[in-house]
């Protein structure tokens, strides 16, 4: 019976499986290209298993390999208004500590509305990262057109 | 012996790793814009290990969180067709059981031919995913151009 | 102590857990429509843990489902230049051996400067892969900008 | 299996009209998606019209409000009617029928027919 149990916890506990998916909670103040996230049941689909929000940024708690995917819709967006108001750019990167800063993901929206992409990179304990939006066009929050997470891979 | 056996069938069948791929296999009627989904091995690369189709839609076999991603291809399609037939959009989610009905993830082709995009999302045994094509343009059955996929990530 | 360490080792070594993410190092001569990768940790962010590189292309080592991941942007582009320039399309297929040449995922640029998506596939020992940019446009060499990479998901 | 023939074809002055047919012999025709490709010298080949089992129809923009696709799901034939041709039509058209059902994905493809537009 114990030993069943251990193995049922094992994945999850000893290696790893963290998991994180976010809804955009708001953006920035005026000078702040960053993206703000929340996540949990009370919000509906969301959920942060293992990794944490730290002031709206993803922090990492264990070291492995994961797989970043983001999508973010522009909210009052055609073709026209994006190539309008071009650039406007997407960045996913490490932010902090300020020694593994380094850009992950970064998608320019041209004449579409959505950018979606993913990507697999090694992230360690107490990285936290950050999602900049540069340009003057804002994000959507429904939670099926902007979100953000984060899934463990391996060691 | 026993034990071995016992290790390496654990985490298909008691912790899921259930995956399904699937390609186009039609459109619906004229007022249903639901796509309609094949998967097997005569079909080339597509594949159901765990989940199943119910009508040409995808119902999830295990609780879990999942990965669900997708690509779409409109069959005929310049800039100037996408723009000119806009909008036409594509939305995932559950839509049945009714309690359960929700948008996963929703794009709109603006002046592209392609939408691809995947998130991670809590599915419940009894799941049924449905996959939305709004507007008038068709989508390719290329299955290199146009297939629809999940995969078990964790309890 | 000595089942701890079997357990551990389980899911890497048994089970495979093989991973890889490149980045572009050059693209191929004239009439070679194929993207030429690199990885490993002295040149950032890139790896592999299984598959291997021959001659630039990502070659197989152990079988089983796996998801299939690229981003690719254009270096000097705007949607200007992509829809001058159309048709600029990537394919990523299994190149050899050529009883098993297929082609996996394509998409075309239209009016946008980035293409991204991704794909579950099975993939057998031995198979190489190889990612086609077809058109006169050059990929951008920025490691975030341009990637391409495999994890394995179940046998 | 399914055999697909194209008829039609030939040399139209520009701004003229041609009617090209494509007959479908084999089960199930009204669930194919069938459509006409073209193949000018040079070029890709190019979807020009699409329709599916139901009637629905897609165009590529260079052919729109020109050409129609059409089907007689009774005759087991596919039509493209083709008016206000320009030197640009020309082409070899082919006849595409994108089986849906059944235990597999299977396409068919007719020999084509030549369509030349002089200005």
């Known amino acids: 019976q114990r030993f069943a149990q251990a193995q049922q916890q094992l994945p999850l506990e000893s290696l790893g499986w963290d998991v994180a998916e976010l809804q955009l909670n708001h953006t920035g103040p005026q000078q702040d290209p960053r993206l703000y996230w929340q996540g949990g049941p009370a919000l509906g689909r969301s959920f942060l298993h293992g990794p944490e929000l730290d002031k709206g940024q993803l922090r990492i708690h264990r070291d492995g390999i994961y797989m970043v995917h983001i999508q973010v819709t522009l909210a009052i967006c055609s073709s026209t208004t994006a190539s309008r108001h071009h650039p406007t750019t997407l960045a996913v990167g490490i932010c902090s500590p300020a020694s593994r800063s380094i850009s992950l993901l970064r998608l320019s929206f041209h004449q579409g509305c959505t950018i979606a992409s993913q990507r697999l990179t090694p992230l360690a304990r107490g990285d936290t990262l950050c999602t900049n939006l540069t340009g003057t066009l804002l994000p959507s929050r429904n939670t099926d057109e902007t979100f953000f997470g984060v899934q463990w891979v391996r060691p | 012996q026993r034990f071995a056996q016992a290790q390496q069938q654990l985490p298909l069948e008691s912790l899921g790793w259930d995956v399904a791929e699937l390609q186009l296999n039609h459109t619906g009627p004229q007022q249903d814009p639901r796509l309609y989904w094949q998967g097997g091995p005569a079909l080339g690369r597509s594949f159901l290990h765990g989940p199943e189709l119910d009508k040409g839609q995808l119902r999830i076999h295990r609780d879990g969180i999942y990965m669900v991603h997708i690509q779409v291809t409109l069959a005929i399609c310049s800039s100037t067709t996408a723009s000119r037939h806009h909008p036409t959009t594509l939305a995932v989610g559950i839509c049945s059981p009714a309690s359960r009905s929700i948008s996963l993830l929703r794009l709109s082709f603006h002046q592209g031919c392609t939408i691809a995009s995947q998130r991670l999302t809590p599915l419940a045994r009894g799941d049924t995913l449905c996959t939305n094509l709004t507007g008038t343009l068709l989508p390719s059955r290329n299955t290199d151009e146009t297939f629809f996929g999940v995969q078990w990530v964790r309890p | 102590q000595r089942f701890a360490q079997a357990q551990q080792q389980l899911p890497l070594e048994s089970l495979g857990w093989d991973v890889a993410e490149l980045q572009l190092n050059h693209t191929g001569p004239q009439q070679d429509p194929r993207l030429y990768w690199q990885g490993g940790p002295a040149l950032g962010r890139s790896f592999l843990h299984g598959p291997e590189l021959d001659k630039g292309q990502l070659r197989i080592h152990r079988d089983g489902i796996y998801m299939v991941h690229i981003q690719v942007t254009l270096a000097i582009c705007s949607s200007t230049t992509a829809s001058r320039h159309h048709p600029t399309t990537l394919a990523v297929g299994i190149c050899s051996p050529a009883s098993r040449s297929i082609s996996l995922l394509r998409l075309s640029f239209h009016q946008g400067c980035t293409i991204a998506s991704q794909r579950l596939t099975p993939l057998a020992r031995g198979d190489t892969l190889c990612t086609n940019l077809t058109g006169t446009l050059l990929p951008s060499r920025n490691t975030d900008e341009t990637f391409f990479g495999v994890q394995w998901v179940r046998p | 299996e399914v055999q697909v023939v194209e008829s039609g074809g030939g040399m139209v002055q520009a701004g003229g009209s041609l009617r090209l047919s494509c007959a479908a012999s084999?089960?199930?025709?009204?669930?194919?998606?069938m459509g006409w490709y073209r193949q000018a010298p040079g070029k890709q080949r190019e979807l020009v019209a699409l329709i599916t089992g139901d009637g629905r129809t897609n165009y590529a923009g260079s052919v729109e409000g020109r050409f129609t696709i059409s089907r007689d799901n009774a005759k087991n034939t596919l039509y493209l009617q083709m008016n206000s041709m320009k030197p640009e039509d020309t082409a070899v058209y082919y006849c595409?029928?994108?089986?849906?059902?059944?235990?597999?994905?299977?396409?068919?493809w007719g020999q084509g027919t030549q369509v030349s537009v002089s200005s």
């Open positions: 595409y029928a994108d089986a849906f059902a059944g235990a597999g994905r299977d396409e068919y």
């Open positions: 084999g089960k199930r025709f009204s669930f194919y998606f």
